[in-house]
């Protein structure tokens, strides 16, 4: 709709087409136009602010009738609102409804609400915090609306007393006097940025601030920038020599994505390194997943993500991103024994050699050690050169001979992607050379001594064959595209679920390929594409619906923010900014485009999993039908409680992870099993988290178990966006055996917490696996 996220909007009642507005405190329907008395805006703390009346929409649940009214934005009434698809709910899950032209709040309403001039729900463009600098608030975000001289301000204000647009960081400026200069998106690098032509970047040095890593990341993102990534020794020198820079500050380096290594939040490759030997990338159990830089030494230090620090944002001078077409299929001819793939030929050499010898051998084959430049290349390695269950380590062409570390490809190509394994790249201090291998199972990279003897992959250019009208082995009719052993075709008619076909998505690689197919729909009206994912039994558990009505378990998930949001739906992929992200839609009324898929071979077998009758190691416990063994670390057996990261690393040190669940019944049984373990009430960390910025606010399990159920209750937390780790509540209740998974108002037992909260925890290991000691 061309509207910016924080722009005012009208609220349209989908069923009547009328707009709502307040009249002397009450909500009524009126004909829609964009007159100011119908304009609303999302403000801080999930509140809806009405521009004309300068009040917030709220619920007075103290009255016998739950009265929907406008309240002063500093009122104690319930002023928060959240979306569930196109409905809007507030306290006690009362939903906004329109009856006889009057706004009201009732628990069983099914009214549809949209933003004026679009098909978007009111939450499709949520409120984005505007962080601050200077002033006296240490970078805290603006509080909108804020009160000055009896007027509520819903945006930053400009006056002669301040150096730029400013805001208050508490509700009542007159009382608290807390303020800061607003950090809003700006074209170019004028007000809050320093331009550096040499590095083609603008830098924003936020020195008088104290934000967590995630807050700093969000602050940069909300300005169309990112936390600082450092890509060369020259850039490091520029930063070290910068006057007035904070002594220690956050950079974009993190390993917040479960089971992945260190990466820059702007997705630049991490091949230049400058770790502090005292705070390295591969820390002990007490280690951390975020990195700060010491401005004096230029060294990077892993540090607790919850610490409050200054930060540096960076944005490119010009935003032209050249998209190389890495996913397009091209038929390729190679010598016998070599694997052809999209213009290149690959050879996995099964003899073990040091890196240098492997490199020499590849050269002798008129090739080089493999260089990997995209996820499409990683996919080749994982799916074509190895059986996915093979856990062998294999040399690639990445090597470092420099101090500070700079990894480069032996074939001279530019490093455009890095794909590090957990706690990698872990480079020994002041020791070179350093070489890189990958693990066949996932293709993730690891730094090794170059003398290690490993298998290796050689790569060379192949002969591209002439393009045909359709990709080889795909149906001859127009529009089929090949990816691996599968063909895909987009059908552009918008239809209800299941009309054309049921698409399954089984891996990150397939998802990336599909994202590439859907990218051309970015600029048009926001389109959706059906997948075959559905909750047939309306119990909150999603499975792939495949041919013949067979259900197939989810092996990979890619949910959007706050998804899966409701039971009984069908799943579509969005396009635009969050391309490929999964959202639950109504199976009958919602219409979307389709992507159909034809396998050239049969559907692969389901992955072999542990058996319920496998035994548990000593000291670990389980319950009937469970495929896992559990070890509970609660107050009666531990010296201290731990934050989420400490708990997860503790479990990893045992060869385990914080516990995860795939099925509704599993968590019910698990909780029942736990209630018998100890008395009293306990909050226990589990593996569920949304710490990684890549997740865009969706949840993931720390052991890579895909999310297939509605897990997180949709209860309100003011600071939900920074409650990134989940815990379960367990208490002994001998009188109750029944549990409700996703929708229990009486007893919500799963809740997001700030990740630095100290809690007890539960580790989980698959049955049949021996823990580390």
């Amino acid at each position: 709709s061309g509207r910016a996220a924080n722009d005012p909007f009208t609220i349209v009642h989908g069923n009547t087409g009328k707009c709502i507005k307040p009249v002397y405190g009450w909500i009524v329907a009126d004909d829609c136009d964009e007159t100011e008395d119908k304009l609303w805006k999302w403000v801080s703390q999930h509140r809806l602010f009405h521009l004309h009346s300068q009040k917030c929409l709220g619920l007075d649940i103290t009255k016998s009738v739950n009265e929907l009214r406008m309240f002063s934005c500093d009122s104690s009434a319930m002023l928060w609102w959240k979306c569930e698809h196109h409905s809007l709910y507030g306290a006690a899950r009362y939903r906004l409804a329109l009856k006889d032209g009057h706004g009201t709040a009732i628990s069983n309403a099914s009214d549809v609400w949209k933003k004026g001039g679009s098909e978007e729900s009111l939450c499709d463009q949520p409120y984005h915090e505007i962080y601050t600098r200077d002033g006296n608030s240490y970078g805290r975000p603006c509080e909108f609306p804020f009160l000055i001289d009896g007027t509520w301000h819903h945006d930053c204000i400009l006056d002669e007393d301040h150096s730029g647009p400013w805001c208050a960081t508490t509700l009542n400026y007159e009382y608290d006097r807390k303020w800061g200069i607003c950090l809003k998106p700006e074209n170019g690098c004028e007000d809050n940025w320093e331009k550096n032509e040499q590095f083609g970047s603008c830098y924003q040095f936020n020195t008088q601030t104290a934000l967590s890593w995630k807050e700093a990341y969000v602050s940069c993102q909300n300005q169309g920038a990112d936390l600082l990534s450092i890509n060369s020794a020259a850039e490091l020198t520029y930063l070290k020599e910068k006057e007035g820079i904070a002594k220690i500050f956050w950079i974009g380096l993190n390993q917040l994505y479960s089971a992945r290594g260190w990466e820059w939040s702007d997705h630049k490759p991490l091949n230049f390194l400058n770790w502090d030997p005292d705070r390295p990338s591969a820390p002990t159990i007490g280690g951390s997943s975020c990195a700060r830089m010491d401005a004096e030494s230029g060294l990077w230090q892993s540090f607790s993500c919850e610490a409050q620090l200054p930060y540096v944002c960076r944005k490119p001078l010009n935003n032209t991103v050249e998209l190389t077409d890495v996913w397009t299929y091209s038929d390729t001819r190679c010598d016998a024994g070599w694997l052809p793939n999209n213009g290149f030929c690959y050879l996995l050499v099964n003899e073990s050699n040091s890196w240098d010898k492997a490199h020499a051998k590849c050269k002798a084959f008129s090739s080089d050690l493999i260089s990997i430049h995209s996820l499409a290349d990683v996919e080749v390695v994982v799916t074509k050169l190895h059986n996915e269950d093979i856990k062998e380590e294999v040399w690639i062409g990445l090597k470092n001979i420099n101090i500070p570390t700079l990894f480069q490809w032996s074939d001279g190509t530019e490093v455009t992607l890095t794909y590090w394994d957990e706690n990698e790249p872990n480079v020994p201090y002041n020791k070179t050379p350093n070489c890189v291998s990958y693990l066949g199972e996932l293709g993730q990279w690891k730094v090794q001594s170059c003398e290690e003897k490993l298998k290796y992959v050689c790569k060379r250019k192949g002969e591209k064959l002439n393009d045909a009208s359709s990709d080889k082995m795909c149906p001859p009719d127009e529009g089929w595209k090949r990816h691996g052993e599968t063909c895909y075709k987009i059908y552009e008619d918008e239809v209800p679920f299941g009309t054309n076909c049921n698409l399954t998505i089984t891996s990150r690689f397939e998802q990336e390929y599909l994202n590439d197919l859907m990218k051309k729909y970015d600029k048009s009206l926001r389109k959706y594409f059906w997948t075959g994912l559905r909750d047939v039994d309306s119990c909150g558990e999603y499975n792939w619906a495949t041919v013949g009505g067979r259900r197939r378990a989810v092996t990979f998930s890619n949910w959007n923010f706050l998804e899966p949001a409701s039971p009984g739906g069908c799943v579509a992929m969005s396009t635009g900014k969050s391309v490929g992200k999964w959202e639950v839609k109504d199976c009958r009324s919602f219409k979307a485009l389709s992507i159909c898929k034809k396998m050239s071979g049969p559907l692969g077998p389901e992955e072999a999993s542990p058996k319920p009758d496998d035994p548990c190691p000593e000291g670990w416990q389980s319950f009937p039908a469970s495929l896992s063994c559990y070890k509970v670390f609660h107050a009666e057996r531990i010296v201290r409680k731990r934050n989420w990261e400490e708990a997860e690393r503790f479990c990893q040190a045992l060869g385990a992870h914080l516990s995860s669940f795939s099925h509704v019944d599993e968590i019910k049984e698990f909780l029942h099993f736990l209630t018998d373990q100890f008395s009293g009430q306990h909050w226990l960390w589990i593996g569920l988290n949304k710490r990684s910025p890549d997740l865009q606010g969706s949840w993931q399990w720390s052991d890579r178990t895909p999310v297939s159920t509605i897990i997180m209750p949709n209860e309100f937390q003011q600071d939900y966006d920074i409650r990134d780790c989940a815990a379960v509540k367990v208490f002994h209740r001998p009188w109750r055996r029944g549990w409700h998974f996703y929708d229990d108002r009486e007893f919500i037992y799963l809740r997001p917490f700030a990740c630095d909260t100290k809690l007890e925890w539960v580790c989980q290991i698959p049955k049949g696996r021996t823990p580390k000691t």
Epitope: K21, V23, Y24, G25, W26, V28, A29, D30, E36, D37, H52, S53, Q54, K55, V65, E67, R69, S72, D100, G101, H102, T104, D149, G150, T151
Partner: antibody
Framework: EVQLQQSGPVLVKPGASVKMSCKAS????????MHWMKQSHGKSLEWIGI????????SYNQKFKGKATLTVDKSSSTAYMELNSLTSEDSAVYYC???????????WGQGTTLTVSS | QAVVTQESALTTSPGETVTLTCRSS?????????ANWVQEKPDHLFTGLIG???NRAPGVPARFSGSLIGDKAALTITGAQTEDEAIYFC?????????FGSGTKVTVL
Amino acid sequence: EVQLQQSGPVLVKPGASVKMSCKASGNTFTDSFMHWMKQSHGKSLEWIGIINPYNGGTSYNQKFKGKATLTVDKSSSTAYMELNSLTSEDSAVYYCARNGVRYYFDYWGQGTTLTVSS
Amino acid sequence: QAVVTQESALTTSPGETVTLTCRSSTGAVTISNYANWVQEKPDHLFTGLIGGTNNRAPGVPARFSGSLIGDKAALTITGAQTEDEAIYFCALWYNNQFIFGSGTKVTVL
């Protein structure tokens, strides 16, 4: 044509209570909001309060909280105002007026004269 | 509590333009005060003219218009007529209650 018909003049003794009415005709009663105003002799208007006939919700001028009580009877499309503990200060003409979604007072009653005298 | 102030009296001639204003003791009048203008003619005949600062009630002649001028609400009669002679009250909405001004007596000579 919308009309607001108010009850007739009242004479009461100090300390008593009175309940006056304002009957709406010619429109959907619950589509609008009903205001009550007081005009003492030779003085300006004072706003007493507003009631939402749809749900019975009210807002009062702080000065009249405890003095006036606004109610509605949807079945007869009538709004009521009860005034209690009357004194001579309460002697005035009382008006009802309605507004719709455009904020203005589009229709007014003819007024009810209240005299409080011993 | 806020006090709403109006001119006590204004005199104009037929065909002339006259502007009545409404000031708030708490600061500038804004759209969130939903300024209303009410006309009182002899025999307690009240008519609502303007609501929500600038919405004219049905049947009210177009010569009546509402606006904000500076920090005040205003009612402008463009081309006054003899039948416009009346008392005009302004009412401002503060924290879920209206407060009326004392009224402006307009004479059209």
